[in-house]
């Protein structure tokens, strides 16, 4: 089962997730979605990286963490009751079903 | 040390191109990022891309896109900017700068004058 | 892409006052990406503040750096002359990098 995470209303939520870059500049694409991860990608994405920048973002969701070293821990600003759920943490890893999934759960009190 | 040079300022009419150089010393070149970040006269900054010499890979501002063409020569530790057709909009100084913006070029100065 | 608002746009100190410069993102940076420069006139921007709040090698102690998400801000304990200059923040983690508009601080 998934891994709870707690936050009040009003407050930010912090989702940890985690991986080593193999080398600096070289690093492994990673998504976020709303949603347990699916087969492939992530379902509604809400953050996104490359291998080097975060390339795509929506308005509360940011990296605060030293992603470039492989903290990859979304923030959510300012959480109301509706961003309760499943979240999916993606390390992209190149190759066939290499991929590293993380559903956590964020419960908003 | 470190050292990020630049080539000298330029005067060129408008809807021709320039190559702006930066040599860097100091570190092994192909392992760190390069970007470009122009600067218009008493204005503010403007990232223009960043290249990655030990691949080649580049990523533009889409601003920039069409404008400027970014290049490494791995053999002579030089990053270049090729900077085409262009306009008054485009006299400025543009900077070279390091992988992680702790390091910068003196500036080349752009002036596109007829 | 990012924006990232700095105010006031031109300010004015005496020596030993305290100063404190902000700079507002439109969205949430990396405060390991959110960086500061100082700039004089005909010279490079030096990198000032890295990191949101860790000083580059050689400068003042009386620099200081803040602040996390969208709100970050540079602070100067004293004022000196040496000070005066244009400041920058700069974010690097979100593609379009992009910086702020600058502030350029004055000696009164």
């Known amino acids: 089962s998934e891994v709870e995470y707690r936050a009040e209303v009003g407050q930010n939520a912090y989702l940890p997730c985690f991986y080593t870059p193999a080398a600096p500049g070289n690093l492994v694409p990673v998504c976020w979605g709303k949603g347990a991860c699916p087969v492939f990608e992530c379902g509604n994405v809400v953050l996104r990286t490359d291998e080097r920048d975060v390339n795509y973002w929506t308005s509360r969701y940011w990296l605060n963490g030293d992603f470039r070293k492989g903290d990859v821990s979304l923030t959510i600003e300012n959480v109301t009751l509706a961003d309760s759920g499943i979240y999916c943490c993606r390390i992209q890893i190149p190759g066939i079903m290499n991929d590293e999934k993380f559903n956590l759960k964020l419960v908003i009190k | 040390q470190i050292q990020l040079q630049q080539s000298g300022p330029e005067l060129v009419t408008p809807g021709t191109s320039v190559k702006i150089s930066c040599k860097a010393s100091?570190?092994?070149?192909?392992?760190?990022?390069i970007n470009w970040v122009k600067q218009r006269p008493g204005q503010g900054l403007e990232w223009i891309g960043w290249i990655y010499p030990g691949s080649g890979n580049t990523k533009y501002n889409e601003k920039f896109k069409g404008k400027a063409t970014l290049t490494v020569d791995t053999s002579s530790s030089i990053a270049y900017m090729h900077l085409s057709s262009l306009t008054s909009e485009d006299s400025a100084v543009y900077f070279c700068?390091?992988?992680?913006?702790?390091?910068w070029g003196q500036g080349t100065t752009l002036t596109v004058s007829s | 892409q990012i924006v990232l608002t700095q105010s006031p746009a031109i300010m004015s100190a005496s020596p030993g006052e305290k100063v404190t410069l902000t700079c507002s993102a439109s969205?949430?940076?990396?405060?390991?990406?959110l960086y500061w420069y100082q700039q004089k006139p005909g010279s490079s921007p030096k990198l000032w503040i890295y990191s949101t709040s860790n000083l580059a090698s050689g400068v003042p102690a009386r620099f200081s750096g803040s602040g996390s998400g969208t709100s970050y801000s540079l602070t100067i304990s004293n004022m000196e002359t040496e000070d005066a200059a244009s400041y920058f923040c700069h974010q690097w983690s979100n593609s379009p990098y992009t910086f702020g508009g600058g502030t350029k601080l004055e000696i009164k």
């Open positions: 100091g570190y092994t070149f192909t392992d760190y990022y």
């Open positions: 700068a390091g992988d992680r913006f702790d390091y």
């Open positions: 969205s949430g940076v990396s405060s390991s990406y």
